[in-house]
């Protein structure tokens, strides 16, 4: 008789999840010599230990501590780029501007990027059928708690000027419920971070509005200012040109507003 299995609202664990995590770890540590000391089998064991045999709605940050310890990594604290709802452009930017880092450029972020995972209470099985959805099922699921944990640590490590890329095409350019709005903003350390600089990325070709005046951006400014961190904002009217100018800063067309 097949055992009854909890049906969740979200997609199940990504196909070949254990193999993918292990492969990404091997690749990352091979390419980034400063992480060469990491034992990928131990990393996978710690990752697995965070959610296997546990109820997928009852995961805590504590569950991920062994993994966090193994994945400890120093990135230049003044070169951090946060993002919200605009991951692809943020990653394209750090591919070109190698001196800056998103969370997904670190080992732990790289391991989990675009993956889904969960287990089942009291069995060592990975659930490939369904996993809890943050809204419809529960927020303390393995994926959400992982990103909350690594995002908090990433924000805590930041110093000097921190940049954040925001999606100007969305109704809420700054969303208090996003990982950036609910975790990272509140974990920037005022004693280390001088300024948060927001880059609002425009979607439409003809969109010349000053989205830095958007009410949600003003809300972000208020939250940041109350935390004794300065705030600045820039419109990126042409994201394609912006990337080109990062690649070729000496191009004559790059002196005008992007």
């Amino acid at each position: 008789v097949p055992r009854w299995r909890q049906q969740w609202s979200g997609p199940g664990t990504t196909k070949r999840f254990p193999e993918t995590v292990l492969a990404r770890c091997v690749k990352y540590t091979e390419i980034h010599p400063e992480m060469r000391h990491v034992d990928c089998q131990s990393v996978w064991d710690a990752f697995k230990g965070a959610f296997i045999s546990k109820h997928p709605c009852n995961i805590t940050e504590e569950d991920y501590q062994p993994l966090m310890k193994l994945g400890t990594q120093t990135v230049p604290c003044n070169k951090i780029l946060l993002w919200s709802r605009i991951k692809d452009l943020a990653h394209q930017f750090t591919q070109v501007q190698r001196d800056m880092f998103t969370l997904e450029d670190t080992l732990l972020g790289y391991l989990a990027d675009d993956l889904t995972w969960c287990g089942e209470f009291n069995t060592s099985k990975i659930n490939y059928q369904s996993c809890p959805d943050w809204r419809k099922d529960c927020s303390n699921n393995p994926v959400s708690v992982f990103w909350k944990t690594v995002s908090r640590r990433f924000a805590e490590a930041a110093c000097d000027v921190v940049h954040v890329m925001l999606n100007g095409s969305r109704s809420k350019i700054f969303d208090k419920n996003s990982t950036f709005g609910s975790v990272e903003v509140h974990n920037l350390q005022p004693e280390k971070v001088q300024t948060l600089e927001a880059w609002v990325i425009h979607g439409g070709r003809e969109d010349s509005r000053d989205l830095c005046q958007d009410p949600t951006i003003k809300e972000l400014e208020s939250i940041i200012s109350k935390r004794n961190i300065q705030f600045s904002c820039k419109n990126i009217y042409r994201p394609d040109k912006f990337l080109q100018c990062v690649k070729n800063p000496e191009d004559s067309s790059c002196t005008s507003e992007i």
Partner: antibody, heavy 119, light 106 residues
Framework: EVQLQQSGTVLARPGASVKMSCKAS????????MHWVKQRPGQDLEWIGG????????RYNQKFKDKAKLTAVTSTSTAYMELSSLTNEDSAVYYC????????????WGQGTLVTVSA | DIQMTQSPASLSASVGETVTITCRAS??????LAWYQQKQGKSPQLLVY???TLPDGVPSRFSGSGSGTQYSLKINSLQPEDFGTYYC????????FGGGTKLEIK
């Protein structure tokens, strides 16, 4: 703008050694792997090896382990490849090429250095 | 070492057609596969990495797919500038290239 400028055409005798250069600009030289690729006329691409200027880490294709030596001078952002005990089989275009952030593809290439081995 | 077998070795097609090039690895390369285009006398150009990701600036008519040991590159609505030689590359270990596919105008 990322640029990889390679040294010019080389004509060498069998048994000799040659050292070619690849001058990088437009990025932090010590933060990326520099790879070298061989292409014989009308033939396929072969990976020779890679060098990480940040800590002089080196990886070789076993086939080229005794043939090629990869080095770099970080102060001038220049990578070098020396080929020894040249034979006709070493006549080829040699490319230096830089990986992307996580080395998931060779995103930038030099223009190639043609090496001709002839008595 | 992992060997990469590319097929077909050559292919002729007309502008506007769709073509697919395949690449088989002798072992699992975990999606660490890149595709390049090379024109006569020029350096190769990166078209796809991580099996399916297009670098900034590569036209969307190019698409990569596959996993494990089987991968493919699809070019929709061929343009005159798409003709040349295409190579797959295993980025997982030892960076071995496939034998190339020469795409010619019919």
């Amino acid at each position: 703008e990322v640029q990889l400028q390679q040294s010019g055409t080389v004509l060498a005798r069998p048994g000799a050694s040659v050292k070619m250069s690849c001058k990088a600009s437009g990025y932090t030289f010590t933060r990326y792997w520099m790879h070298w690729v061989k292409q014989r006329p009308g033939q396929d691409l072969e990976w020779i090896g890679g060098f990480y200027p940040g800590n002089s880490d080196t990886r070789y294709n076993q086939k080229f382990k005794d043939k090629a030596k990869l080095t770099a001078v970080t102060s001038t952002s220049t990578a070098y490849m020396e080929l020894s005990s040249l034979t006709n089989e070493d006549s080829a275009v040699y490319y230096c090429t830089r990986g992307d952030r996580h080395d998931e593809g060779f995103a930038y290439w030099g223009q190639g250095t043609l090496v001709t081995v002839s008595a | 070492d992992i060997q990469m077998t590319q097929s077909p070795a050559s292919l002729s097609a007309s502008v506007g057609e769709t073509v697919t090039i395949t690449c088989r690895a002798s072992g699992n390369i975990h999606n660490y596969l890149a595709w390049y285009q090379q024109k006569q006398g020029k350096s190769p150009q990166l078209l796809v990495y991580n099996a399916k990701t297009l670098p900034d600036g590569v036209p969307s008519r190019f698409s990569g797919s596959g996993s494990g040991t089987q991968y493919s590159l699809k070019i929709n609505s061929l343009q005159p500038e798409d003709f040349g030689t295409y190579y797959c590359q295993n980025i997982w270990t030892n960076y071995t290239f496939g034998g190339g596919t020469k795409l010619e105008i019919k």
